[in-house]
Interface confidence: low
């Protein structure tokens, strides 16, 4: 008799794929056109990325450092009207994209939480949660919570409001902290909070160190659902050497949890790579005309248009990974096991019951390496086969679907491989 199928875990929508942050509406849409109506026209692009949620804003009225002139219930007219926002929500819903609203209060100011008036700000946030939940948003983000006094108790209260409205709503908190103890203490009082931090960016970017960071994090947070990013708001290029971008995309999409990206991560957008741009919000490069100030500053391979036409581009890789992440059970909610491999490598398996299994091998080093996979430290339920089929490589030249012998597996410098193999009873 066939073995019984393992019962599927309860899956919330944010478990099923990546979140995409648009912190600056104007920079995302390009010069002079950054409003909610314009963003509606970019939803097809977000659909093509197969992201499950859009983390948007802040959009509310905020006069720098002035609590009285900060209204979390009012959209800044520069971004559009409440009606524009409602239209965006409706359009996003039709495309199965959830909208998460950033309510970080003093986003134009020095201290994002008006440090001297925390209580009155907390009340404003509470009212805003109720208001925007009724308006139909799918969740909220608040950032820089290390600067919020009594953050844990406020977050617990805000999570209760959010979940009290519907278990299907999400609260995301962001911190600049990379300290695991601090992160764990924030998570302990909030059962369903998604926390973004700088934890992974505090790395020497070697295979061994990254493996140890990931395993320590997962051990410390137990079996709770987590998110993966390199920061609470920044671009991957601000934290990573260029040659590791593809590797990290592969890793973020295949670790157990929700990958969180910022607009432009999918094309390798660089902060302040072009003259006169604000560091924190570079203009999204849709095509070669996105930066008209300096003719020739933008080449096709830096842009969404150029990369969409190139199957070997970072954007194409992002789309493929996002597609795999959103449809394969082992990547959606599978168990995770690391195992020994050659120096400089980080290797792990994702598997769920009798579904197709995935092997990820990441070479962080600048030299080609034999994978040296040693599966002796894997549980019997996750044993390695002799061969696995290539789903994708972060480097050009390998053919998708080709069977690779795991014993003789070699990786190019900075190459990551995603391989699949069937469950065998």
């Amino acid at each position: 008799r066939a073995p019984r199928c393992r019962e599927l875990p309860a899956q919330k929508w944010w478990h099923t794929g990546a979140l995409y942050r648009i912190g600056d509406l104007q920079a995302f849409q390009g010069h002079g056109s950054g409003n909610l109506a314009g963003l509606k026209g970019r939803l097809d692009y977000l659909s093509s990325l197969k992201v499950k949620g859009l983390v948007l804003g802040p959009l509310h009225k905020n006069q720098k450092d002035d609590v009285a002139q900060t209204d979390l219930l009012q959209i800044d007219p520069n971004f559009g009207s409440k009606e524009d926002f409602d239209n965006l929500l409706q359009s996003a819903k039709k495309k199965s994209i959830r909208v998460i609203l950033d309510l970080t209060p003093n986003y134009r100011g020095e201290n994002l939480w008006f440090s001297t008036q925390v209580d009155s700000v907390a009340t404003k946030v509470k009212d805003a949660l109720e208001f925007w939940l009724q308006a139909g948003v799918d969740g909220f983000q608040v950032r820089d919570i290390e600067n919020l006094k009594d953050a844990s108790s406020f977050l617990a209260e805000w999570e209760n409001i959010t979940k009290g409205f519907s278990e299907d709503r999400l609260l995301i908190a962001g911190t600049n902290s990379s300290d695991l103890q601090q992160i764990v203490s924030l998570l302990e009082s909030n059962k369903d909070l998604l926390l973004t931090s700088s934890y992974l960016s505090d790395s020497s970017f070697t295979g061994e160190h990254t493996k140890s960071l990931v395993t320590q994090y997962l051990n410390a947070t137990g079996n709770r659902w987590c998110s993966w990013s390199l920061s609470q708001a920044g671009l991957l290029t601000s934290f990573l050497p260029a040659q590791l971008l593809r590797l990290y995309q592969l890793m973020l999409f295949t670790l157990p949890g929700t990958p969180v990206f910022s607009y432009g991560d999918e094309i390798g957008l660089k902060a302040a790579a072009l003259p006169g741009q604000p560091v924190e919000a570079p203009v999204m490069l849709w095509d070669e005309s996105s930066f008209p100030d300096i003719p020739g500053a933008v080449s096709a391979n830096m842009t969404v248009k150029g990369q969409s036409e190139d199957p070997g581009s970072l954007l194409s890789l992002f789309r493929q990974l996002s597609d795999q992440r959103s449809k394969e059970r082992s990547l959606l909610h599978g168990d995770f096991h690391t195992f020994s491999s050659g120096p400089g490598l980080f290797s792990y398996i994702r598997h769920w019951d009798q579904n197709e299994r995935f092997l990820v091998v990441l070479n962080f080093g600048d030299v080609g390496l034999s994978a040296g996979l040693q599966a002796s430290d894997l549980p019997a339920s996750a044993s390695l086969p002799t061969k696995a089929d290539l789903v994708l490589s972060t480097q050009p030249g390998r053919e998708e679907g080709s069977p690779l012998e795991l014993e003789r597996l070699k990786l190019e410098p900075h190459e990551g491989l995603l391989l699949r193999f069937p469950y065998v009873a």
Partner: antibody, heavy 118, light 107 residues
């Protein structure tokens, strides 16, 4: 724009050798695998195999092991198919077509007709 | 090897008519299927990949869909340049295999 341009038609006798070339332009040849596909007159398409343009390693389908050889001249952005000891049943049009990951066979050459007749 | 059974092998249709071609896979191919068009002059063009994604520049009258192991190519309203041979291709595993082809002719 992306193009695969193949060499012209060939008329050969049985036992001879033919070499067909496929020149890639508009992209870097080493970023994409190159497949070869056979179409006999009035028949459908048959996959012959592919060459990993990054490593140069060829893979042949079972029916095309032995007399068939894929090669690569990276500096000239050109892939080639050589057929040795030609037989009448090799009469066909041969296509090159690029592929990478799930973008398999997205661009095709115009085809090269090979006629084998004594 | 994975067999792709394409039907019908030929069909006659009029301009403006809606036509559907089907391709059945003998094993699971998880949506890794493309549709190709071969014009009378022999040139081959990919129309659809990943079962339903339209290649850029391909007219919207072409669409692809999947139902289990059956994959379909639909042309919503035939135009004169659509009279050609159509092949399905699976790229889920090696060797790559093609369907036997469907010839779409003018009635």
């Amino acid at each position: 724009q992306i193009q695969l341009v193949q060499s012209g038609p060939e008329l050969k006798k049985p036992g001879e050798t033919v070499k067909i070339s496929c020149k890639a332009s508009g992209y870097s040849i080493t970023n994409f695998g190159m497949n070869w596909v056979k179409q006999a007159p009035g028949k459908g398409l048959k996959w012959m195999g592919w060459v990993n343009t990054y490593t140069g390693e060829p893979t042949y389908a079972d029916d095309f092991k032995g007399r068939f050889a894929f090669s690569l001249e990276t500096s000239a952005s050109t892939a080639s198919l050589q057929i040795n000891n030609l037989k009448n049943e090799d009469t066909a049009t041969y296509f090159c077509t690029r592929s990478v990951i799930t973008y398999t066979m997205d661009y095709w050459g115009q085809g090269t007709s090979v006629t084998v007749s004594s | 090897d994975i067999q792709l059974t394409q039907s019908p092998s030929s069909l006659s249709a009029s301009l403006g008519e809606r036509v559907s071609l089907t391709c059945r896979a003998s094993q699971e191919i998880s949506g890794y299927l493309s549709w190709l068009q071969q014009k009378p002059d022999g040139t081959i063009k990919r129309l659809i990949y990943a079962a339903s994604t339209l290649d850029s520049g391909v007219p919207k009258r072409f669409s692809g869909s999947r139902s289990g192991s059956d994959y379909s190519l639909t042309i919503s309203s035939l135009e004169s340049e659509d009279f050609a041979d159509y092949y399905c291709l699976q790229y889920a595993s090696y060797p790559r295999t093609f369907g036997g082809g469907t010839k779409v002719e003018i009635k």
